[in-house]
């Protein structure tokens, strides 16, 4: 997250970190069910661990943390690398979470976002770009949803209705390492960090997010079929 600020503790209990050994974060994710996460399809790895209820990036033990294995990864069938469409994936945890103030699922919004809607994006991704500098603790940033037309102007021929753009002033954006993390609008999960320009936070180059309102049926049906 570029030019965000430290999230208040306990305010993002659905935020998950996807880790490679040894405790190396490579993507964010979101708890949407007691045993299921959503993340970006481009975050797919064969073997990984999931950390929930953790505030700092470092592997230091925190009393609210819960650790899991990802036992099943189900990318959306419409996702095709290196395209950006349908960039979402469900991850089944090896067991159900223990609900606490630090670990709690969030509902996926069935309403599509309106231009101007204020949202919050969070993650442990780099705080500088093109340099790489990772934060000590989870970062939060207020962003506004942009119209599809503004999005199309910024990224011609690359935008479809499985994506939405959001941004703030130049110099504020999600970035590498935030992928798969949540965009929360009006208390519901509206999007996942998907892609954007490089370097991050360039003027008139907003972040692009997976438009989850288009996938509520697929999410529900996939969880039910694999539970």
């Amino acid at each position: 997250i570029i030019n965000g600020s430290d999230c208040d503790m306990h305010t993002q209990p659905w935020q998950a970190a996807l880790l490679l050994r040894p405790n190396q974060l490579y993507c964010g994710a979101v708890l949407v069910h007691p045993q299921w996460l959503l993340t970006a399809a481009h975050c797919r790895k064969k073997v990984f661990r999931v950390r929930l209820g953790h505030y700092s990036l470092s592997p230091v033990y925190e009393s609210g943390q819960q650790m899991f294995q990802g036992v099943k990864s189900i990318p959306h069938p419409g996702y095709s690398h290196p395209g950006h469409s349908n960039d979402l994936m469900l991850i089944k945890l090896n067991r159900r979470i223990r609900p606490t103030k630090d670990v709690r699922p969030i509902n996926v919004s069935s309403h599509c976002p309106s231009a101007g809607t204020k949202c919050l994006v969070s993650g442990w991704g780099t705080t500088k770009s093109p340099q790489v500098h990772f934060p000590k603790v989870l970062q939060c940033l207020n962003i506004s949803v942009l119209s599809q037309k503004r999005c199309e102007d910024a990224y011609p021929r690359q935008i479809d209705d499985t994506m939405f753009c959001a941004g703030d002033k130049a110099g504020r954006d999600s970035c590498q390492g935030d992928s798969g993390g949540p965009v929360v609008c009006n208390g519901s999960l509206q999007g996942l960090v998907s892609w954007g320009d490089y370097p991050c936070a360039r003027p008139n180059r907003p972040g692009v997010y997976t438009n989850l309102c288009k996938f509520t049926k697929w999410i529900q049906e996939t969880i039910q079929a694999n539970s």
């Epitope: 599509c112 309106s114 231009a115 949803v145 119209s147 599809q148 037309k149 503004r150 199309e152």
Partner: antibody, heavy 117, light 110 residues
Framework: VKESEGGLFKPTDTLTLTCTVS????????ISWVRQAPGNGLEWIGY????????YYATWAESRSTITRNTNLNTVTLKMTSLTAADTATYFC?????????????WGPGTLVTVSS | AYDLTQTPASVEAAVGGTVTINCQAS??????LSWYQQKSGQPPKLLIY???TLASGVPSRFKGSGSGTDFTLTISDLECADAATYYC????????????FGGGTEVVVK
């Protein structure tokens, strides 16, 4: 913004209209083409983006319309192939204002295109 | 996608009266909606942009409201000069769009 002269065309002809702009940069404002058949409502044909000059079209117009621009000459061109009588209309070149939520804030006077055998 | 349905197709009101024109989007377009007035033989003129902001030189008798999918143009203290056709248009998306304009509403002033 001002459109070039329309005129009388035959079915199957190709229409080429040029819009000349002054007082602003095509790199800052998108340009749309809109048409209006006699006694009918406004019909959007397509537009060309400001920064990259990429064109988007209405679904009905996509297969036979091309919008291009020349930023040095301050012109935007609409080319429409395979004309039929249904293409008879007044064609407007319009400036879109991104600051105003892409409202159409400057309209040309329009040019009449008649398609008849 | 993002089709606009404008109602009514025609409305008649007396001088000094009020008319209300509705525009409904098939999907949420935030506040990216504008209103236009067109008189016979002339190009349309921008009245209101971003749902409720009055364009320069437009009298305050014209009022736009709404957001998301439902929008309204209200013309109060009607004058003879307000007799025209009014159109709404969306500026939210241009991909896979049939028409960005509503069908139009003819306002007749008695």
């Amino acid at each position: 913004v001002k459109e070039s002269e329309g005129g009388l065309f035959k079915p199957t002809d190709t229409l080429t209209l040029t819009c000349t702009v002054s007082g602003f940069s095509l790199s800052s404002y998108p340009i749309s083409w809109v048409r209006q058949a006699p006694g009918n409502g406004l019909e959007w044909i397509g537009y060309i983006t400001s920064e990259y000059g990429v064109a988007y079209y209405a679904t009905w117009a996509e297969s036979r319309s091309t919008i291009t621009r020349n930023t040095n000459l301050n012109t935007v061109t609409l080319k429409m192939t395979s004309l039929t009588a249904a293409d008879t209309a007044t064609y407007f070149c319009v400036r879109e204002n991104p600051t105003y939520g892409y409202a159409y804030d400057a309209w040309g006077p329009g040019t009449l295109v008649t398609v008849s055998s | 996608a993002y089709d606009l349905t404008q109602t009514p197709a025609s409305v008649e009101a007396a001088v000094g009266g009020t008319v209300t024109i509705n525009c409904q989007a098939s999907e949420s377009i935030g506040n990216e909606l504008s209103w236009y007035q067109q008189k016979s033989g002339q190009p349309p003129k921008l009245l209101i942009y971003q749902a409720s902001t009055l364009a320069s030189g437009v009298p305050s008798r014209f009022k736009g409201s709404g957001s998301g999918t439902d929008f309204t143009l209200t013309i109060s203290d009607l004058e003879c000069a307000d007799a025209a056709t009014y159109y709404c248009a969306q500026g939210f998306s241009s991909s896979g769009v049939e028409n960005v304009f509503g069908g139009g509403t003819e306002v007749v002033v008695k």
